[in-house]
Interface confidence: low
């Protein structure tokens, strides 16, 4: 019996989380599934066979980055009912291909118990095309991340970018969390130089990257896929 790496992700109502999952191989179906209470099966939430579970349509995104051997699943407009146990995986059989367990906890306010975690303050995710920060702490097997509320508490320094047509003092609009088992501590603030780097290098390399308009790894995107092709059941 294989013991899966486990990740814990925290999100707030109305906010969003980004789950990082290992990508074991290319050209295979990858997915995020949700453990069904009672049945023990894992029902597909989103997969690369163009399936999205009905209650996640318009607010879930899957992007894969083969050169970094990972894929990202972003869930936006979080509700309390999104709390639960999920799993990343690869392969045509959802139940058998799981690679990482993900526990998502969605709540309206952060309980004091979270302040007791022996971890440095976790940087925030900002809903901005050019400004990314990665979580500052992770362990090899379990990970807990904390995010700020959609109505951000605390001040954000003004940042000037060369691309936006209006100069603005950036304030976060959507809270974000990102996690993967075994991720290393790192924080990024990109410069304004428009160099040609890949989105993943900008996200993952331990350096301060530069961004052009290709590197917008996380923008909140919600589309109504009126005609999804294919159906996926539980397993």
């Amino acid at each position: 019996l294989r013991i899966l790496p486990e990740v814990k992700v925290e999100g707030e109502l109305g906010g969003s989380v980004t789950i990082k999952c290992p990508l074991p191989e290319m050209h295979v179906r990858i997915y995020l599934c949700r453990e069904m209470a009672g049945s023990g099966t894992c029902g597909t939430v989103v997969s690369t066979t163009n399936f999205i579970k009905a209650e996640y349509k318009g607010r879930v995104t899957l992007k894969q980055y083969p050169r970094k051997n990972l894929f990202l699943v972003e869930v936006t407009q979080l509700t309390e009912s999104d709390s639960g146990v999920y799993a990343c995986g690869a392969g045509m059989n959802t139940d058998r291909g799981k690679t990482q367990k993900v526990t998502l906890n969605v709540h309206s306010e952060y309980e004091p118990s979270w302040e007791e975690q022996p971890m440095p303050e976790t940087p925030k995710w900002f809903h901005l095309p050019y400004l990314f920060q990665m979580p500052a702490y992770a362990s090899s097997s379990k990970f807990v991340t904390r995010v700020t509320t959609p109505a951000q508490r605390g001040k954000v320094p003004p940042v000037h970018h060369s691309s936006p047509t209006t100069q603005i003092t950036h304030r976060p609009r959507v809270s974000r969390a990102s996690s993967v088992a075994g991720d290393k501590p790192r924080t990024f603030l990109p410069s304004t130089t428009a160099s040609k780097i890949s989105a993943l290098e900008g996200l993952l390399k331990p350096q301060t990257p530069s961004y052009n308009h290709h590197t917008r790894l996380h923008r909140q995107r919600a589309l109504d896929y009126g005609s999804q092709s294919g159906r996926e059941g539980q397993g």
Partner: antibody
């Protein structure tokens, strides 16, 4: 950067078929979703189809569903559009387009940051 | 599908003047709107994405604004290369749709 060169256009009779190709360069092809946009003479652009970086996900506008098929060969950095049951309404300049990144799921389409120069498809008897 | 209506259909201006182009969506596209410029015999070129962000290599005299259903492309001082047709495009809903275009011509 990035460049795309389309080929395969030409004159075809109504009901006929054509296969368009797009040879891309200057970027990591498999990392980016690609698409086709067409433009009839004197009209604005019309999005036709898109395909994810792996080729596992495809998307079509309503008027071409069931007639057109988009595919890609990442080993050759090439994308294709197989067009069947062509009609006069399909007459247009067909552009190969590149999206800024790969995409799947519900929040995943984009603008087009690079376009080829187009290949002309004329459907006429 | 979302219909994008551009106005005016034609804008007659002189070099150095300010151009203001409008794009109105039949329903909200939030900030997910792009602008392209197309010169005769050329493919469209991305100018602005997500309503306000300039694409690589686009000069500061070109700017975008708006959200929801009403968007504006502004060229603060027209240069010779700006006389072309401009299209808006939304990516908020499938199918992706373009506006009918605004032609900016030399007066």
């Amino acid at each position: 950067g990035g460049a795309a060169v389309e080929s395969g256009g030409g004159l075809v009779q109504p009901g006929g078929s054509l296969r368009l190709s797009c040879a891309a360069s200057g970027f990591t092809f498999s990392d980016c979703a690609m698409g086709w946009v067409r433009q009839a003479p004197g009209k604005g652009p019309e999005w036709v189809a898109a395909i994810s970086g792996s080729g596992l996900s495809t998307y079509y506008t309503g008027s071409v569903k069931g007639r057109f098929s988009i595919s890609r060969d990442n080993s050759k950095s090439t994308m294709f559009l197989q067009m069947d049951s062509l009609s006069a309404g399909d007459t247009a300049l067909y552009y190969c387009t590149k999206a800024p990144w790969d995409y799947y799921g519900s929040g995943n389409t984009d603008h087009f940051d690079h376009w080829g120069q187009g290949t002309l498809v004329t459907v006429s008897s | 599908e979302i219909v994008l209506t551009q106005s005016p259909a034609t804008l007659s201006l002189s070099p150095g003047e300010r151009a203001t182009l409008s794009c109105r969506a039949s329903q909200s596209v939030r900030s997910y709107l792009a602008w392209y410029r197309q010169r005769p015999g050329q493919a469209p070129r991305l100018l602005i994405y997500d309503a306000t962000y300039r694409a690589a290599g686009i000069p500061a005299r070109i700017s975008g604004s708006g959200s929801g259903t009403d968007f504006t492309l502004t060229i603060s001082s027209l240069e010779p290369e700006d006389f072309a047709v401009y299209y808006c495009q939304q990516r908020n809903n499938w199918p992706l749709t373009f506006g009918g275009g605004t032609k900016v011509e030399i007066r």
